[in-house]
């Protein structure tokens, strides 16, 4: 007797995170024996949604016109084949934004630094939130997610970076996002360039990235060192 | 620096084929959004539709019935065909890139020079 | 299909003038609005994005702000470059519709 069937591929285009009304398409991956394609959300009556296969019949096709609230959250796909039902997909999270305000990104003291010394982002937002993500232009994911203890709400985080290397140059944004649903996050922020000079022991000045609007992901998305910060925040690494 | 240039025949009869095609140097063709705009003699600008690196495409739905945008990755090239042309097609006709980021969109930040294309019998 | 409104559809300021020029969307778009300026001849440029984003190379004097509905283009102290038509365009869900233009001219 065979084993179970693979289980499919799931993921999304553009990506995971999407802002309020643009369109996102929903792709799975299966076989080429694959009959017919199932996406199940999370707290949703099954099947969310069924496709037929697309030639050659190893994927299917689920489109969101325009994202909304109702969109976001967690997916798994299955695909039906001659001998019966795949195994579950990977789950895919679907992340709104553009769901709250957008916080305020600084830098403590100055968004110049010099190489070896220290700096903090500081994502503040207007109204109390449980939990802000700091991401650097190019990451395709984000590099801190700060989240408060016991659903305590906070108007701030902060991001410490120490000793800052030329590596940490570039510009950054955060959002801020409430607990209840990490699935919907706030505006971005506006961006922030941090900008790293050389230090006294290397005088060759650091080479920083200038201001991109390029959108691919980083190979290495940087992670800030340096202590917890003192507003009640835990520290995920993403 | 990215840099796009439209190319494509600069004159047509009416209810021929509009190729152009649009060549993305200095950068790649993902993982971005792809955008043909078009503005009439001393007219506005008018979005013609989208093209993701991917495949998927949305359209101007006055245009819809007559418009294929298509896009060649090893080319680093995307493409844009109208067909049944008339007087109104004429326009000077804009490739242009949206970027993605997590989470938010950029607008369409680098832009061909753009191509004069004129319909006329 | 949303509709983008441009008002007004053209100005002359004097150099060192503050100008507003607005866009009103017909539904809401929340915050995903951009502006571009068009010198004569010349291709379009990219000033702001999400509604209140300066691009980047864009001068400082050049602002944005609104959401929703409503959303205006500040430039704080008109310079002679300045001398444009200036366009804003809803870019979040298709068609990403442009406003028809505001032609602006220096007295």
């Known amino acids: 007797q065979a084993g179970p069937l693979p289980k499919p591929t799931l993921w999304a285009e553009p990506g995971s995170v999407i802002s309020w009304g643009n369109s996102v398409t929903i792709w799975c991956q299966g076989t080429l024996e694959a009959r017919e394609y199932r996406l199940d959300k999370e707290e949703s009556p099954a099947p969310w949604d069924r496709q037929n296969p697309l030639e050659p019949k190893n994927k299917a096709r689920f489109s969101i016109p325009s994202m909304t609230e109702d969109y976001a959250g967690r997916y798994r796909c299955y695909y039906r084949s001659p001998v019966g039902w795949s195994q579950p997909s990977d789950p895919l999270e679907l992340v709104m934004t553009g769901a709250y305000s957008k916080p305020t990104l600084s830098a403590l003291p100055s968004p110049l630094v010099t190489s070896g010394k220290s700096v903090t982002l500081l994502c503040q937002s207007r109204s109390p939130m449980d939990t802000f993500l700091l991401i650097k232009e190019r990451a395709a994911h984000p590099l801190l997610h700060l989240r408060s203890e016991h659903g305590a709400q906070q108007h701030q985080a902060e991001f410490p970076m120490s000793p800052v290397t030329s590596v940490h140059g570039g510009t950054y944004r955060c959002f801020s996002s409430h607990g209840f649903s990490h699935y919907l996050l706030s505006h971005p922020s506006d961006p922030l360039e941090l900008i790293v000079s050389g230090s006294l022991e290397d005088p060759r000045p650091s080479p920083t990235r200038s201001v991109s609007t390029a959108a691919g992901p980083e190979d290495q998305p940087l992670m800030p060192t340096g202590s917890v910060p003192h507003s009640g925040l835990r520290r995920h690494w993403e | 620096q990215v840099q796009l240039q439209e190319s494509g025949p600069g004159l047509l009869k009416p209810s021929e084929t509009l190729s152009l095609t649009c060549t993305v140097s200095?950068?790649?063709?993902?993982?971005?959004?792809w955008s043909w705009i078009r503005q009439p003699p001393g007219k506005g600008l008018e979005w013609i539709g989208y093209?993701?690196?991917?495949?998927?495409?949305n359209y101007n739905p006055s245009l819809q019935s007559r418009l294929t945008i298509s896009v060649d990755t090893s080319k680093n090239q995307f493409s844009l065909k109208l067909s049944s042309v008339t007087a109104a097609d004429t326009a000077v006709y804009y490739c242009?890139?949206?970027?993605?980021?997590?989470?938010?969109?950029?607008?369409?930040?680098?832009w061909g020079q753009g191509t004069t294309v004129t319909v006329s019998s | 299909d949303i509709q983008m409104t441009q008002s007004p559809s053209s100005l002359s300021a004097s150099v060192g003038d503050r100008v507003t020029i607005t866009c009103r969307a017909s539904?809401?778009?929340?915050?995903?609005l951009a502006w571009y300026q068009q010198k004569p001849g010349k291709v379009p440029n990219l000033l702001i994005y999400?509604?209140?984003t300066l691009q980047s190379g864009v001068p400082s004097r050049f602002s944005g702000s609104g959401s929703g509905t409503d959303f205006t283009l500040t430039i704080s102290s008109l310079q002679p470059e300045d001398v444009a038509t200036y366009y804003c365009?809803?870019?979040?869900?298709?068609?990403?519709?442009f406003g028809q233009g505001t032609k602006l001219e220096i007295k």
């Open positions: 999400l509604a209140s």
């Open positions: 093209i993701y690196y991917s495949g998927n495409t």
């Open positions: 200095g950068g790649s063709i993902s993982p971005y959004y």
């Open positions: 539904q809401d778009i929340s915050i995903y």
């Open positions: 242009a890139r949206r970027g993605y980021s997590f989470g938010f969109y950029y607008g369409l930040d680098v």
């Open positions: 365009q809803k870019y979040n869900s298709a068609p990403w519709t």
